[in-house]
């Protein structure tokens, strides 16, 4: 029998340029009579144009919703009711071609054409895009708070905040032709639930979403987003009611930046430069295409690309890359944002060099990508270290910590976390190396102690990049480096003259002069440690709650012993900057470290002094007894302590701790404590120092109180942020 044809609604969005009209400010106000009359005329013209083509039979409805510069640009949407089997045949490209063809056919015609009665439409200025019913609904919900802004070349336009009576607003932004718009979003409140979405077109088309941000992101307090061209839309959706705008938006047109480079690398190892997407650290724009050609000086070298919080992965089934597509020597890889460092190593097989292409495959983009490039020796990619094939990084081998996710850096070790004697491969503990007493059969542990040696897992790297064999040579009163750099920055780690309480757990004034108390509204929240004249280190998880993220809330006390009283040695500071480790992950506690910049430098005294920071190669030997200090609870679930408490804890081998915590212990963690429980850190100690005393008598920061199962529970250790695992970031920030 007869079967009715199934019809489907196909939605299109677009814009057209009118050459014989000019844009005026009146047209930005939807309530103005100018807007109403222009809309009526433009709507009539649009309907007539569509119905003049073979699309006319499918015409359902249309709307002109906005105007812009150029001389006059009309922004519209329309719906066609199409037989289902024709759906794919009427793509936006086909519809655009049909409408352009119609416009061209009447350009020189003297016959009266209804849609040309008032408007001279530029065929070249017609754009048709795919849209959906959902997109139109989203657009309509913003029309009560719709702002159009044109921003000229060289201008930076600060956008007027949203109308708080509305639940949603749209900023329609336009810049000069041939330029691209750069939008800057700065969150100004610590906490909010507002949502902002940026689009690469005039309206909220889901398929042209560049990015969306939500809720006063602390990870990205400032976001810069690039459109692919001169048009952009920003949609705001209200979160919690607030009288203050939780963000500031500004926009500026910028010129297209070429992203093509030819480089010839020097005959040396390590990083030689940086490649980045245009306007880094801005988000890369939709339709970004970068092509970098690097020439390597010899086939002995491979090319290394070091990424920060971004990795390259093979993508199955030719699915589009959502975070950037890379082609390297005809291999297709997809970018992936991760909270880890990563390196891609490219073996070089021909002198022709290597071409690296980066493309944004979809309109959805993300933070700009920056990559350091350099050479590595193909026959020995990681001198003195282990090449972790999982992430391309060079990691210490046989140091007792599985730095590589597959643990291969700790496999097949003759001597793990010890020194291997040359004579017979016996293992001796590291503190015995270069201590003036031969422990190996023929004394190989005391050889080469006064000269440079190849860098390795436990060697110390001097400032001139040479390495010394003696483990932990920092600040021991004897220069071991030729340049003396192992004895620089040594005004640290000394306790003040203190009257110790023998056998007690209460600390005395000046005993732990680096100890900090981090307080909010007079209440102790976390511990910390002074590491430089203006820097205190603590745990990132202290700022986990949005309400704790603002620097203005915090006061840092140094030289403090008692919480309920002040004494003359005590000083307090406000916080001018708060930096969480960029790889910090709340769920796993990985990279649990933060740095607070004090509002003024400390004046050192017997009660206020920094602790020494270890070098990356510093070895805190498992078994060593170290100390934790803090005002944390004296029992699980109890109130914080009034007096600064101290307790000695033993450092635990990583594998043993990892077993206890079911392999949740990462290489940036360190374990200490007792199986019997009893001695441990507790709530309120977080961020406080775990310090170990070197033979020189100086105290080095080994860890920060991070997490653990309960407090002092039997069979569970305390887990600390391993300072040697995050030291490069600390040094980068502090210096």
């Amino acid at each position: 029998g007869y079967k009715a044809e199934v019809m489907v609604s196909q939605v299109y969005s677009g814009s057209l340029r009118v050459l014989n009209r000019h844009f005026s400010q009146d047209l930005t106000r939807r309530e103005s009579s100018a807007f109403r009359s222009e809309t009526a005329k433009a709507q009539k013209m649009l309907k007539e144009l569509i119905t003049s083509t073979r699309l006319g039979t499918y015409y359902n409805s249309s709307s002109v919703y906005s105007f812009g510069e150029g001389p006059l640009t009309c922004f519209f949407w329309f719906i066609l009711q199409i037989p289902e089997h024709r759906r794919l045949m009427l793509s936006p490209e086909v519809v655009q071609a049909l409408l352009v063809e119609e416009l061209l056919s009447t350009v020189n015609s003297s016959a009266a054409v209804p849609y040309r009665a008032e408007y001279e439409v530029d065929p070249e200025g017609l754009v048709i895009l795919e849209a959906s019913v959902k997109d139109i609904a989203a657009l309509n919900s913003t029309l009560g708070c719709y702002r159009y802004s044109y921003v000229g070349q060289g201008q930076v336009l600060r956008l007027k905040g949203p109308d708080h009576l509305a639940s949603s607003c749209l900023w329609h932004l336009q810049g000069p032709k041939d330029l691209m718009l750069k939008l800057r979003l700065e969150w100004t409140l610590a906490e909010c639930r507002d949502r902002l979405a940026m689009y690469d077109v005039a309206g909220p088309l889901e398929k042209r979403l560049i990015t969306s941000v939500y809720g006063c992101s602390r990870q990205e307090p400032v976001v810069e987003v690039l459109a692919s061209g001169a048009i952009m839309a920003v949609v705001w959706k209200k979160g919690l009611h607030s009288y203050y705008d939780p963000f500031v938006l500004s926009v500026q047109p910028v010129v297209f930046q070429a992203c093509e480079v030819n480089l010839t690398l020097d005959n040396r190892l390590d990083s030689q430069g940086v490649l980045s997407t245009p306007y880094f650290p801005s988000y890369y724009s939709p339709q970004t295409h970068c092509s970098w050609h690097l020439t390597v000086p010899s086939l002995d070298y491979g090319l290394a690309l070091w990424f920060d919080a971004y990795a390259l992965r093979r993508q199955k089934y030719d699915l589009p890359c959502t975070q950037g597509q890379w082609t390297i020597q005809n291999r297709r890889l997809c970018g992936l944002r991760i909270l880890q460092p990563y390196a891609e190593r490219i073996p070089v097989v021909a002198t022709a060099g290597i071409t690296i292409n980066f493309t944004s495959q979809i309109s959805l983009t993300g933070p700009g990508v920056r990559v350091h490039y350099g050479l590595y020796n193909q026959s020995d990619p990681c001198p003195g270290e282990f090449l972790c094939s999982v992430n391309g990084l060079c990691v210490p081998a046989c140091d007792g910590v599985k730095d590589c996710p597959n643990g291969l850096d700790e496999r097949n070790c003759v001597c793990r976390a010890t020194f291997q004697c040359k004579e017979d491969s016996t293992c001796i503990s590291l503190p015995k190396v270069c201590d003036g007493q031969p422990d190996c059969l023929n004394g190989s542990d005391e050889e080469q102690c006064q000269e440079g040696v190849p860098c390795g897992t436990f060697t110390f790297q001097c400032e001139d990049r040479s390495c010394v064999k003696k483990p932990n040579p920092q600040c021991d009163g004897r220069p071991d480096c030729r340049d003396g750099s192992d004895e620089e920055h040594c005004d640290c780690g000394l306790q003040g003259p203190s009257s110790r309480i023998v056998g007690g757990a209460v600390s005395s004034e000046g005993e732990w002069p680096w100890q900090a108390s981090l307080q909010v509204r007079g209440r102790h929240i976390c511990g910390g440690a002074l590491i430089a004249d203006r820097w205190v280190i603590t745990a990132a998880h202290c700022f986990q709650e949005d309400s704790m993220a603002s620097t203005v809330l915090w006061t840092v006390f140094l030289g403090k012993v008692w919480q309920n009283s002040r004494w003359p040695g005590e000083v307090s500071f406000k916080v001018s900057r708060l930096l969480l480790h960029p790889y910090h992950e709340e769920d796993s506690h990985d990279y649990d470290v933060a740095l607070l910049q004090l509002d003024h430098p400390v004046v050192r005294s017997a009660a206020v002094r920094p602790v020494c920071l270890p070098a990356r190669s510093h070895f805190f030997e498992p078994g060593l007894h170290c100390w934790i200090t803090g005002w944390g609870a004296l029992r699980e679930g109890g109130p914080i302590s009034n007096a600064l408490q101290k307790v000695d804890v033993q450092l635990i081998p990583q594998d043993l701790c990892s077993e206890v915590y079911r392999y949740q212990v990462t290489p940036r963690m360190l374990c200490a404590g007792y199986r019997k429980g009893k001695k441990d850190a507790c709530q309120g100690d977080s961020g406080g120092p775990l310090v170990c005393k070197a033979l020189s008598g100086r105290w080095f920061l080994a860890g920060l109180v991070s997490w653990g199962l309960g407090c002092g529970r039997p069979n569970y250790f305390g887990v600390y942020t391993r300072i040697t695992g995050v030291i490069s970031w600390i040094q980068q920030v502090v210096t």
Epitope: P622, L624, P653, Y674, R675
Partner: antibody
Framework: QVQLVESGGGVVQPGRSLRLSCAAS????????MHWVRQAPGKGLEWVAD????????NYADSVKGRFTISRDNSKNTLSLQMNSLRAEDTAVYYC?????????????WGQGILVTVSS | AIQMTQSPSSLSASVGDRVTITCRAS??????LGWYQQKPGKAPKLLIY???SLQSGVPSRFSGSGSGTDFTLTIGSLQPEDFATYYC?????????FGQGTKVEIK
Amino acid sequence: QVQLVESGGGVVQPGRSLRLSCAASGFTFSYFGMHWVRQAPGKGLEWVADISYDGSDENYADSVKGRFTISRDNSKNTLSLQMNSLRAEDTAVYYCAKETYQSLMYLEYWGQGILVTVSS
Amino acid sequence: AIQMTQSPSSLSASVGDRVTITCRASQDIRNDLGWYQQKPGKAPKLLIYTAPSLQSGVPSRFSGSGSGTDFTLTIGSLQPEDFATYYCLQDYNYPWTFGQGTKVEIK
């Protein structure tokens, strides 16, 4: 390569004293708690005493309390057991043993043992 | 002091047999218990710690279980080198105390 070597054993008359020593090598002695355990001929094991890594804490079996003293010299990597007022029932092989990490406190490594005979 | 009672005091078994030794504490000791193996004229060797944890290098045929007051050492399939005396040791409280030992002999 952990090695524990006991010395100082022998035959002694009841009421007299004897000092046992244990020389440790192959590990950082000052990090670990140390123990003495004994075994009378043909009998089971009996825990005698232990000392913490820094010498600040000692514990004894009731049978030796007040007569035996455990001590250590971390600079010489040596553990000692001073045995006074010896009795016939103190006759045994004496083992020195090293704890694993204090967080675990198991007797991981043992010396080969030294015989002490208390007899008139 | 906490008393540790081991049973049986001796047992005869053949190669390939499954052997179970039990240890009972006179009070709750959580899981603070280790198992040691001693061969004639030799020092004891740690097999199991914290009741169920196998010391590294010890064959997986040895296993420990239990907590509170009742503990078990199981040898899944007895091998010729397993004929020895086995002791449990509580380290929950001072003074530490051993069980009286279980001698495993060839049938």
